[in-house]
Interface confidence: low
C-alpha cells in the first residue's frame, strides 16, 4: 500500500492527526523533501551571523559572517574573527606570526617559510610575516659559465602548507 504521506510535496508536511492532509510548513520552517511528517525549523542568522539566503518553505536559510569574521565548519556553522595578514588567531586574540613563519590571509594560521635549500635553491627574496620567501636559482646555477637559469618553483596556492 502506498503511504499517503508520500504525496505531500516539499514545503508541506503530512498531518498524522488530520487524515494525512498535506499542510504547508508554518512560518520559519521548511521541508526540503516530500513525504515529511514535520517541517524543520529554519536556521536563524543572528549575532555575528548574517543571512546570505532567506529561508523558504522548501529550503533552509544560509548564513555567512559579518565583516571582520569568516565562516568555519560545514554550512558556516561558526564564525571566527579575522586577523590581519601576518597574524594568526590564538586564544588570546590576534598575534603576530613568529620569526620564520608567515600568513598571507586574514584567517588561518602562520606557516613556516619555504626552505629553499630542500630544492637545492637559494633565497631570492627574504620572507616576512605576511609573505613567504621567494626561492631563486641554486648557487651553482649562478656560477660563471652556467648555461641556463632554473626558473623558480611554481607558486603554491594560498592556504596550502609546504609539502
Amino acid at each position: 500500500l502506498q503511504d499517503p504521506c508520500s504525496n505531500c510535496p516539499a514545503g508541506t508536511f503530512c498531518d498524522n492527526n488530520r487524515n494525512q492532509i498535506c499542510s504547508p510548513c508554518p512560518p520559519n520552517s521548511f521541508s526540503s523533501a516530500g513525504g515529511q511528517r514535520t517541517c524543520d525549523i529554519c536556521r536563524q542568522c543572528k549575532g555575528v551571523f548574517r543571512t546570505r539566503k532567506e529561508c523558504s518553505s522548501t529550503s533552509n536559510a544560509e548564513c555567512d559572517c559579518t565583516p571582520g569574521f569568516h565562516c568555519l565548519g560545514a554550512g558556516c556553522s561558526m564564525c571566527e574573527q579575522d586577523c590581519k595578514q601576518g597574524q594568526e588567531l590564538t586564544k588570546e586574540g590576534c598575534k603576530d606570526c613568529s620569526f620564520g613563519t608567515f600568513n598571507d590571509e586574514e584567517h588561518g594560521v602562520c606557516r613556516p617559510w619555504t626552505d629553499c635549500s630542500l630544492d637545492g635553491k637559494s633565497v631570492l627574496v627574504n620572507g616576512t610575516k605576511e609573505r613567504d620567501v621567494v626561492c631563486g636559482p641554486s648557487p651553482a646555477d649562478l656560477s660563471p659559465g652556467a648555461s641556463s637559469v632554473t626558473p623558480p618553483a611554481p607558486a603554491r596556492e594560498p592556504g596550502h602548507s609546504p609539502q
Epitope: N17, N28, S29, T38, C39
Partner: antibody, heavy 118, light 110 residues
C-alpha cells in the same frame, strides 16, 4: 512504534557518556526526535532536538554540554563532561506536528538513568 | 526565551471532583501548547495538543482550553487513576524556547 533508550550508568564527573535511543516502527527521516531529562524528584527539562534532516537545536543551557547525532535508526546523546547536576533520567521522545504547527511529543521511551558521582 | 509558569504546584481533589491547572506563558504562543501526564516511574504521556485537542485514547474528562498566554487543563470527574504530575509544554518551532515545559503540577486524589 517504539522508542528505547540505553547507555545510562554510573559515571564519575568529567567522564563523557553517550546515550542511545533506538527507534522502530517509524523512520527518523520522517520524524524529528528530542532528548528530555528529569532529575530525581524534579520536573522535565528539554535538552535538544535533531530534525529529520539532521539539524540540531539545543536549549541555551545545554549548548556545549550535550551533542545530539543520529544514524538511520538511532539517536545518540553525548554528555560531554558530566557533572553531578547531570544526574537524571534521560528520555528520548518523538516529535510530531500538525496543521496548527504545534510540535509535541507523541512517543516516549521509558528513560535511562544516569548517575554522576565521584 | 519563552517561560511557562504552572499553578498550583500541587492540588488535592476528591474522587468525582474537578481539578483545574493553569499554565501561563511569558509571551503569546498562539495555542501552541500541549499537556502531559506523568506517573511515578513512567515517561510522560501526551494528553492534549494544540491547547484543546484530545490525544488518541485520552478520556473525555480531560479538557484543554486557552489562548494567547493563558491556558488551562481541567479534569472533570476525577478518578484515582488521575493521580499524577501534569506538565504543559510550549510549541517546538519556537527554537528560542529554553525550557519547553512548565514546572509541573502534582494532583493528589483523596
Amino acid at each position: 512504534q517504539s522508542v528505547e533508550e540505553s547507555g545510562g550508568r554510573l559515571v564519575t564527573p568529567g567522564t563523557p557518556l553517550t546515550l542511545t535511543c533506538t527507534v522502530s516502527g517509524f523512520s527518523l527521516s520522517s520524524y524529528a526526535m528530542s532528548w528530555v531529562r528529569q532529575a530525581p524528584g524534579k520536573g522535565l527539562e528539554w535538552i535538544g532536538i535533531i530534525s529529520t534532516s539532521g539539524i540540531t537545536y539545543y536549549a541555551s543551557w545545554a549548548k556545549g554540554r550535550f551533542t545530539i547525532s543520529k544514524t538511520s535508526t538511532m539517536v545518540d546523546l553525548k554528555i560531554t563532561s558530566p557533572t553531578t547536576e547531570d544526574t537524571a533520567t534521560y528520555f528520548c521522545a518523538r516529535l510530531n506536528g500538525f496543521d496548527d504547527y504545534v510540535r509535541y511529543f507523541d512517543f516516549w521511551g521509558l528513560g535511562t538513568l544516569v548517575t554522576v558521582s565521584s | 526565551a519563552i517561560e511557562l509558569t504552572q499553578t498550583p504546584s500541587s492540588v488535592s481533589a476528591a474522587v468525582g471532583g474537578t481539578v483545574t491547572i493553569n499554565c501561563q506563558a511569558s509571551e503569546s504562543i498562539a495555542s501552541n501548547l500541549a499537556w502531559y501526564q506523568q506517573k511515578p516511574g513512567q515517561p510522560p504521556k501526551l494528553l492534549i495538543y494544540a491547547a484543546s485537542y484530545l490525544a488518541s485514547g485520552v478520556p473525555s474528562r480531560f479538557k484543554g482550553s486557552g489562548s494567547g498566554t493563558e491556558y488551562t487543563l481541567t479534569i472533570s470527574g476525577v478518578q484515582s487513576a488521575d493521580a499524577a504530575t501534569y506538565y504543559c509544554q510550549s510549541a517546538f518551532y519556537v527554537s528560542s524556547s529554553d525550557n519547553a515545559f512548565g514546572g509541573g503540577t502534582e494532583v493528589v486524589v483523596k
